[in-house]
């Protein structure tokens, strides 16, 4: 049977259906891939340009293969088994009305099915299987793969690799309620917040009294100590870590191969030798990089640094004086860490709303 011979796969949504918002389509495919990555060691990364392993497209009729679409109804989509070129690709008939509900044709359900083919699964004769050849509506919010589907995909790729457990190192540093404690980098990671310091990090669930501590090397042996900036793109399960002129990508808590990469590939000028802090704003789909007295803005959709940057922090972030240690995005606010203190900043009204101890997250 055909299968991918690698764990890390890329996908690209070549074009979008006009039936839905682009961000809904992006989210649906991210969730459809997650259905399969949750039960296998496979990891998926979205590309915005170039050839991906799995190219996704919406098309009418003849569209570049022998398998013409037939108009509304009938064939909803088709996908190719793993391999080079067109192999692995998934095509959706634009003549259908694609939706995220029970009306029309639910894109999520068809996507999970087609991506099953893209990963090497054949049709199933079990009506409870998502690989059953006939479309039927199921509630996407409560959707679960059948035991058959899990068994079949795991026969190709095996069970998921457990994410490394966040355990306590043997000699934790002294209490974090120390008055002058500062952090190297702070970011959300899923529902948790990670506070990086030297060779370790603290992590906690907001609102929970429990605080945990883990050495960086125990969870990610390939990542160095002394991380200087970090941000998360939660919708993609991606965590980016920066040190000096390099950065690393952690996907679903697993480091991506072919990293570290140079920060200059992101569009920084040669004068930038390190990033002080970074934060991703999901509402704007921008990453803000803080470097000395300036900040840079990166567009994650276009994968390009925005023109006319860098700009002065003090001019565009009123009330914020350099130098910045770390920035956290949490509940539509930026938390800007400077030494033993942090400023709660509202980016909508462009003003500082609170000054707090940097350790306030730990109940200090």
């Amino acid at each position: 049977r055909s299968r991918w011979m690698k764990r890390y796969l890329t996908y690209r949504i070549y074009n979008y259906t006009p039936d839905m918002k682009r961000e809904d389509v992006d989210y649906i495919f991210q969730k459809a891939f997650q259905v399969w990555s949750d039960v296998t060691p496979l990891r998926f990364r979205k590309l915005h340009k170039d050839e991906a392993d799995i190219m996704i497209l919406f098309a009418f009729g003849a569209h570049g293969d022998f398998n013409y679409f037939d108009g509304k109804g009938g064939t909803l989509a088709h996908a190719f088994y793993p391999g080079p070129g067109i192999q692995g690709d998934a095509h959706f008939d634009e003549a259908e009305t694609w939706t995220k509900s029970f009306q029309g044709t639910n894109l999520f359900l068809v996507a999970v099915h087609e991506l099953g083919h893209s990963l090497g699964l054949q049709h199933s004769n079990n009506p409870k299987s998502i690989m059953y050849p006939t479309y039927r509506y199921l509630n996407p919010s409560t959707f679960r793969l059948s035991a058959d589907d899990i068994r079949n995909i795991q026969s190709l790729y095996g069970a998921p690799v457990k994410p490394p457990s966040l355990t306590k190192p043997s000699s934790p540093p002294s209490t974090f309620c120390h008055q002058s404690l500062s952090f190297d980098a702070v970011t959300t990671v899923g529902e948790k917040i990670f506070f990086f310091k030297d060779w370790f990090f603290w992590w906690k669930l907001p609102g929970s009294p429990a605080t945990n501590i883990t050495s960086i090397s125990s969870i990610w042996p390939s990542i160095p100590s002394g991380i200087q900036a970090a941000y998360e793109i939660e919708s993609r399960n991606q965590l980016f870590l920066f040190k000096d002129e390099k950065y690393w990508l952690i996907n679903n808590l697993v480091p991506e191969p072919h990293y570290p990469r140079s920060i200059y590939s992101l569009g920084f000028s040669a004068s930038v030798k390190k990033v002080d802090a970074a934060v991703f704003d999901p509402l704007r789909q921008k990453v803000y990089f803080f470097v000395d007295k300036h900040y840079w803005r990166y567009d994650v959709r276009q994968e390009l640094m925005d023109p006319a940057y860098p700009k002065l922090i003090s001019t565009h972030f009123p009330g914020i004086k350099p130098k910045i240690d770390a920035v956290l995005y949490f509940k539509r606010h930026y938390y800007i860490f400077q030494g033993a203190y942090q400023l709660e900043y509202d980016p909508l009204f462009r003003r500082v709303t609170k000054t707090l101890k940097s350790t306030s997250w730990f109940g200090c």
Partner: antibody, heavy 122, light 103 residues
């Protein structure tokens, strides 16, 4: 090593019939789409027909539809092209080509035979 | 129906030259375009698939680019063995071919 060897070509009169064969070796034949592509003397390439792994799915160029039939015998690792009602414009070298694996044909031909010449003339 | 238009139909060049052949589809074929090389009396050979992926064993002087309707095949520095006819192809449709001859 993948090898495709066509046979069955020759001289035939207009309106006549011919059956081409393509013997495949060096790979597992059954999971792959297979195709026939032809080339008239001094002209370009023209796709003729394609067949799915099990033989149930077939495609034809409009120029041969209703006259040519593609088939395969997976137990013999052989592809066939039955050509009926032949016309002068069917004169060409006929190549057998292997597609890459898939439930659907990609039309990506990674291996080709050397071809067999079919001449339709009175 | 999808149609492929290849240009030029013939081309004269010298060893060491950089050569570009173009192929245009009358509607989007995404990145589903392949390039083949054919030498006289021989079967075609796959050079590039999916617009830009080099087939195993093909020299790196060959490259492909494009997406949607416009595609190019580039030979960065012509070698004597590169003089042949080149075809673009998408599913059951071939371009009419470009004959590359020695100047």
């Amino acid at each position: 090593e993948v090898q495709l060897l066509e046979s069955g070509g020759g001289l035939v009169q207009p309106g006549g019939s011919l059956r081409l064969s393509c013997a495949a070796s060096g790979f597992t034949f059954s999971p792959y789409w297979m195709h026939w592509v032809r080339q008239a003397p001094g002209k370009g390439l023209e796709w003729v027909s394609g067949i799915g792994p099990s033989g149930g799915l077939t495609f034809y160029a409009d120029s041969v539809k209703g006259r040519f039939t593609i088939s395969r015998d997976n137990s013999k690792n052989t592809l066939y092209l039955q050509m009926n009602s032949l016309r002068a414009e069917d004169t060409a070298v006929y190549y057998c080509a292997k597609d890459i694996r898939g439930a659907y044909s990609s039309g990506l031909f990674d291996y080709w035979g050397r071809g067999t010449l079919v001449t339709v003339s009175s | 129906d999808i149609q492929m238009t290849q240009s030029p139909s013939s081309l004269s060049a010298s060893v060491g030259d950089r050569v570009t052949i173009t192929c245009r589809a009358n509607q989007s074929i995404y990145t589903y375009l392949n390039w083949y090389q054919q030498k006289p009396g021989k079967a075609p050979e796959l050079l590039i698939y999916a617009a830009s992926s080099l087939q195993s064993g093909v020299p790196s002087r060959f490259s492909g680019s494009g997406s949607g309707t416009d595609f190019t095949l580039t030979i960065s520095s012509l070698q004597p063995e590169d003089f042949a006819t080149y075809y673009c192809q998408q599913a059951g449709i071939f371009g009419q071919g470009t004959k590359l001859e020695i100047k």
